[in-house]
């Protein structure tokens, strides 16, 4: 079935929401004053070999648990990331975007990445798909 303008608009809004969430995480941690950044960078993330279509979000979904674990280090009294809620929200968006009908086996690149590289990769992915929809 061809995508309707309303379904395209919904996809675009969901991607924009995902993009904002990922950017918020990146801005929250990738701050030279973040006392835990050095240690957060010791965690490794798997990167997709290819990420050009919505089905490739399967690769992001599979790394959400490790992402939550690292974000647990980023909380502070005045900075309420609430990792569990944030990751839960991202998970809901990812599931809706990639669809649950098709089963896609994610292929990962050989090299692992830091949390900053990982977030930047998925931010770029979201921006790229949004640009094709607009």
């Amino acid at each position: 079935m061809a995508p309707t303008s309303s379904s395209t608009k919904k996809t675009q809004l969901q991607l924009e929401h995902l993009l904002l969430d990922l950017q918020m995480i990146l801005n929250g941690i990738n701050n030279y004053k973040n006392p835990k950044l050095t240690r957060m960078l010791t965690f490794k993330f798997y990167m997709p070999k290819k990420a050009t279509e919505l089905k490739h979000l399967q690769c992001l979904e599979e790394e959400l648990k490790p992402l939550e674990e690292v974000l647990n280090l980023a909380q502070s009294k005045n900075f309420h990331l609430r990792p569990r809620d944030l990751i839960s929200n991202i998970n809901v968006i990812v599931l809706e975007l990639k669809g649950s009908e098709t089963t896609f086996m994610c292929e990962y690149a050989d090299e692992t990445a830091t949390i900053v590289e990982f977030l930047n990769r998925w931010i770029t992915f979201s921006q790229s798909i949004i640009s094709t929809l607009t």
Partner: antibody
Framework: EVQLVQSGAEVKKPGESLKISCKGS????????IEWVRQMPGKGLEWMGV????????NYNEKFKGQVTISADKSISTAYLQWSSLKASDTAMYYC??????????????WGQGTTVTVSS | AIRLTQSPSSFSASTGDRVTITCKAS??????????MNWYQQKPGKAPKLLIY???NLESGVPSRFSGSGSGTDFTLTISSLQSEDFATYYC?????????FGGGTKVEIK
């Protein structure tokens, strides 16, 4: 009981290599970062570097970069600190410690008993 | 690197005394409302032991006579009533910036 047990005292000659160990037990070793701290005779404490046993990712104090190598083998819950060529100035007590950083904390809650390294010709 | 200056470097006290040790950082160790300052106790030939974390939080199992306070660059460790087992060296440590640094230590001796 959560503990870190370090290898025994070492006496070495300048130029020799050395690898000391720190074995964790009583907790999920891969889930906590391990740090190394040096204490020279009669002196204070100096942070050397950190390893994530789960990923193998490391970070070093600039002062110790290229001087030591930190590694880990998560299958045997052990972290290592090694030198390829010891100097007399490496004579010190070396401690491993477990880093806790959840929430708004960042501290060492469990320490190894220390390994004394003596380098003398 | 952040320099931590402890004072005094050593002093003599008697059991029952109220003891105050100060730690001054060369720059603020605060980040988003939290003070990344910890205190450790070390006895001769032993590993350091955590007493206080994030400036004022008492580590589990540490007696309540130990307390910590301060923010920014000025911090204090207080022992309300010194006990015989408290004679040791105390170190402050900042975990706000790499490299983590420790103060030079304060040795508490028996008078």
């Amino acid at each position: 009981e959560v503990q870190l047990v370090q290898s025994g005292a070492e006496v070495k000659k300048p130029g020799e290599s050395l690898k000391i160990s720190c074995k964790g037990s009583g907790y999920a070793f891969s889930n906590y970062l391990i740090e190394w701290v040096r204490q020279m005779p009669g002196k204070g404490l100096e942070w050397m570097g950190v390893i994530n046993p789960g990923s193998g990712g490391t970070n070093y104090n600039e002062k110790f970069k290229g001087q030591v190598t930190i590694s880990a083998d998560k299958s045997i819950s052990t972290a290592y600190l090694q030198w390829s060529s010891l100097k007399a100035s490496d004579t010190a007590m070396y401690y491993c410690a477990r880093w806790r950083g959840e929430g708004y904390y960042a501290y060492y809650d469990v320490w190894g008993q220390g390994t004394t390294v003596t380098v003398s010709s | 690197a952040i320099r931590l200056t402890q004072s005094p470097s050593s002093f003599s006290a008697s059991t029952g005394d109220r003891v105050t040790i100060t730690c001054k950082a060369s720059q603020s160790v605060d980040y988003q409302g939290d003070s990344y300052m910890n205190w450790y106790q070390q006895k001769p030939g032993k590993a350091p032991k955590l007493l206080i974390y994030t400036a004022s939080n008492l580590e589990s199992g540490v007696p309540s006579r130990f307390s910590g306070s301060g923010s920014g660059t000025d911090f204090t460790l207080t022992i309300s009533s010194l006990q015989s087992e408290d004679f040791a060296t105390y170190y402050c440590q900042q975990s706000n910036e790499d490299p983590y640094t420790f103060g030079g230590g304060t040795k508490v001796e028996i008078k």
